[in-house]
Interface confidence: low
């Protein structure tokens, strides 16, 4: 229904702390320049005036679209044009043209130093001083370097960061209670921020209908038991709360995915049985959890998949009369029969059974035409198995730092043109896969490793918009996102680059490596690997073994030496020479 | 192999009541949740109601809502329909099924509301 005042209404649905979080969150995913403080107080300003709507919606202004309040505040930013550049363009732009302006200048690769977290004790008393603006600069940080994080989850985040300081700050020992927990939240929070961007992606370069297809999927694997009407109504309601989301529309989004959550909640007889322990959890936590709800049992009697969709003599017919509906329900049928295949695949598959269906009922014979459908699926299905099958064999002999390298290389041979910093940050990515899904059962290994894979691709896609380099990358991130990995894991190595040059300088290292963190120093050592392929794009594995281990040695022994300066000046040229040696 | 049979049905006068069974066997029918769906003649299925698996959370199609309950016996393996007031445009065959799907392959039992 329509309200008199919108931001009155919004402010009345999510209430005052998670309606001041959500437009924090807005500001900070559209301005990532901007301090917390001067964010803080455009949040303040926009809550106050929520307040005079709220107590009487006819006040001035208070009629005015959420956009228009948002970007006037953005827009009478100080100096916008001084920090921001060619995005105050925006600002002479009517909306909904404004919006759209903010949207498309949302950089994904903020040049913002990393986020450090504080020691333990300073973490704690900065909390304890002030939880609020402790969270509000979680909010800020995380929202500023990732300007699609899916808003009512960064709260979600949020409110878990906060139970944990406020236990761990408890304790005796802090940092052993802090550092695993938080860890953790970072881990999942990190994963949620690629999905959610490839989400987006879907939405922006292929529409709704494109996003739907893969909720349709999604759900139906989830919910076997829900009939088809059911898995269209909630494809429908979760397209429009990504799409808001995507869209910068944060109150609306999490509003309606409130919703979504109480609908869920208040229909878990004709949804599913696994409901009921998210549905008796407070809001937040009770979205998340329905968000990665565990599989409903299958039905136990679906008839084969052929019996409507290549046995019926009406295919042709059903096909024609309502296109999107039939392919809407083979795509269900087929998904809450298959919970152990990843959405790509199952969206491929869809694909490939329209594209059958287009030739073949335009032929004589349909019937004999598409008789040999599901046959055809087979490689379709065998590629992304072989894939899993291979990674993780790969994974599980290497363990997670030397199945990255093993990445690193193939990746830096597919595309050497692409920056070192992008190549390594992909490859870590990609090789946390190993850890995250080769450990799960064999039915869900394949979902977990592919739909993640695609969402990391999806980040490199964008990276390399940016500043494209590579035409085999422009190749694999130009087509449809289904198709993106197996385009990528088809690369080989690049025949038209121009090796570089070997410079020292590259492989020249120096004692402030031995006294950085574990994960640092791992960075450093696969970007002189990358810089390696770079060199030699030819290089054996056995070669690149040899220099790496020759690395690791030395920087053992120069880190244990009594004058590491020293050592590092004098063996460090040694090591460049033994390098350029193994790979002549 | 999985079979649902529904008994209970037959002829009965507007404002009066049946009550409805269906026997399952051939899966573990405490892990599921369990609908009655009906279909009149000459109309496609119509969902009616739906149970979870632990019989706990129920729920009903707006034109059946306070007149109908389902409830079920998990060791008897059995879902019930208990119909009161029952109303001419009840007239139809009345299925058990798995979930929430309206296209189970059970016979069905023919209710007839008629004076």
């Known amino acids: 229904e329509a309200h008199k005042s919108e931001i009155a209404h919004r402010y009345n649905d999510l209430g005052e702390q998670h309606f001041k979080g959500l437009v924090l969150i807005a500001f900070s995913q559209y301005l990532q320049k901007c301090s917390y403080d001067e964010h803080a107080k455009l949040v303040q300003e926009v809550t106050d005036f929520a307040k005079t709507c709220v107590a009487d919606e006819s006040a001035a202004n208070c009629d005015k679209s959420l956009h228009t309040l948002f970007g006037d505040k953005l827009c009478a930013i100080p100096n916008l044009r001084e920090n921001y550049g060619e995005l105050a363009d925006c600002c002479t732009k009517q909306e909904p043209e404004r919006n759209e302006c903010f949207l498309q200048h949302k950089d994904d690769n903020p040049s913002l130093p990393p986020f450090e977290r504080p020691e333990a004790e300073a973490m704690c008393t900065s909390f304890k001083e002030n939880p609020t603006t402790f969270m509000g600069h979680y909010l800020h940080e995380v929202a500023r370097r990732h300007p699609y994080f899916y808003a009512p989850e960064l709260l979600y985040y949020a409110e878990q960061y906060n139970e944990i300081l406020t236990q761990c700050c408890a304790e005796a020992d802090k940092e052993s209670c802090l550092t695993p927990k938080l860890d953790g939240v970072k881990e999942k929070a990190l994963v949620s921020s690629v999905r959610q961007r490839m989400k987006c992606s879907s939405m922006q370069k292929f529409g709704e209908r494109a996003f739907k297809a893969w909720a349709v999927a999604r759900l139906s694997q989830t919910f076997p038991n829900a009939d088809f009407a059911e898995i269209t109504k909630l494809a429908t309601d979760l397209t429009k709360v990504n799409k808001e989301c995507c869209h910068g529309d944060l109150l609306e989004c999490a509003d309606d995915r409130a919703e979504l959550a109480k609908y869920m909640c208040e229909n878990q007889a004709t949804i599913s049985s696994k409901l009921q322990t998210c549905c008796d959890k407070p809001l937040l936590k009770k979205a998340h959890c329905l968000s990665e709800v565990e599989h409903d049992t299958m039905p136990a009697d679906l008839p084969a998949i052929a019996a409507d969709f290549v046995e019926d003599q009406e295919v042709c017919k059903n096909y024609a009369e309502a296109k999107d509906v039939f392919l809407g329900t083979f795509l269900y049928e087929y998904s809450r029969r298959h919970p152990d295949y990843s959405v790509s695949l199952l969206l491929r598959l869809a694909k490939k059974y329209e594209a059958t269906l287009e030739k073949c009922c335009a032929e004589a014979n349909p019937p004999a035409c598409y008789g040999t459908v599901l046959a055809e699926f087979q490689p379709l299905v065998e590629e992304p198995k072989n894939l899993v099958k291979t990674n993780c064999d790969l994974y599980e002999k290497l363990g997670e730092y030397g199945f990255q390298n093993a990445i690193l290389v193939r990746y830096t041979q597919k595309a050497p043109q692409v920056s070192t910093p992008t190549l390594v940050e992909a490859a870590r990515n990609l090789g946390r896969v190993g850890t995250k899904c080769c450990t799960l059962p064999e039915d869900q290994r394949l979902p977990c490793v592919e739909d993640y894979l695609s969402a990391i691709l999806n980040r490199v896609c964008l990276l390399h918009e940016k500043t494209p380099v590579s035409e085999h990358v422009t190749k694999c991130c130009s087509g449809s996102l289904v198709e993106r990995r197996p385009c990528f894991s088809a690369l080989t190595v690049d025949e038209t680059y121009v090796p570089k040059e070997f410079k020292a300088e590259t492989f020249t290292f120096h004692s402030d490596i031995c006294t950085l963190p574990e994960k640092e120093k791992q960075i450093k050592k696969q970007t002189a690997l990358a810089e390696l392929v770079k060199h030699k794009p030819k290089a054996t594995a056995e070669q690149l073994k040899t220099v790496m281990d020759d690395f690791a040695q030395f920087l053992d022994t120069c880190c244990k030496a009594a004058d590491k300066d020293t050592c590092f000046s004098t063996e460090g040229p040694n090591l460049v020479t033994r390098c350029k040696d193994a790979l002549a | 192999e999985v079979q649902l049979v529904e008994s209970g049905g037959g002829l009965v006068q507007p404002g009066g009541s049946l009550r409805l069974s269906c026997a399952a066997s051939g899966f573990t029918f405490g892990s599921f949740g369990m609908s009655w769906v009906r279909q009149a003649p000459g109309k496609g299925p119509e969902w009616v109601s739906a149970?979870?698996?632990?019989?706990?959370?129920?729920r009903y199609a707006e034109s059946v809502k306070g007149r109908f309950t389902i409830s079920r016996d998990n060791a008897k393996k059995t879902l019930y329909l208990q119909m009161n007031s029952l109303k001419p445009e009840d007239t139809a065959v009345y299925y058990c099924?798995?979930?929430?799907?309206?296209?189970?392959g059970s016979q069905g039992t023919q209710v007839t509301v008629s004076s």
């Open positions: 149970i979870d698996s632990g019989g706990a959370d129920t």
């Open positions: 099924t798995i979930g929430r799907s309206t296209s189970r």
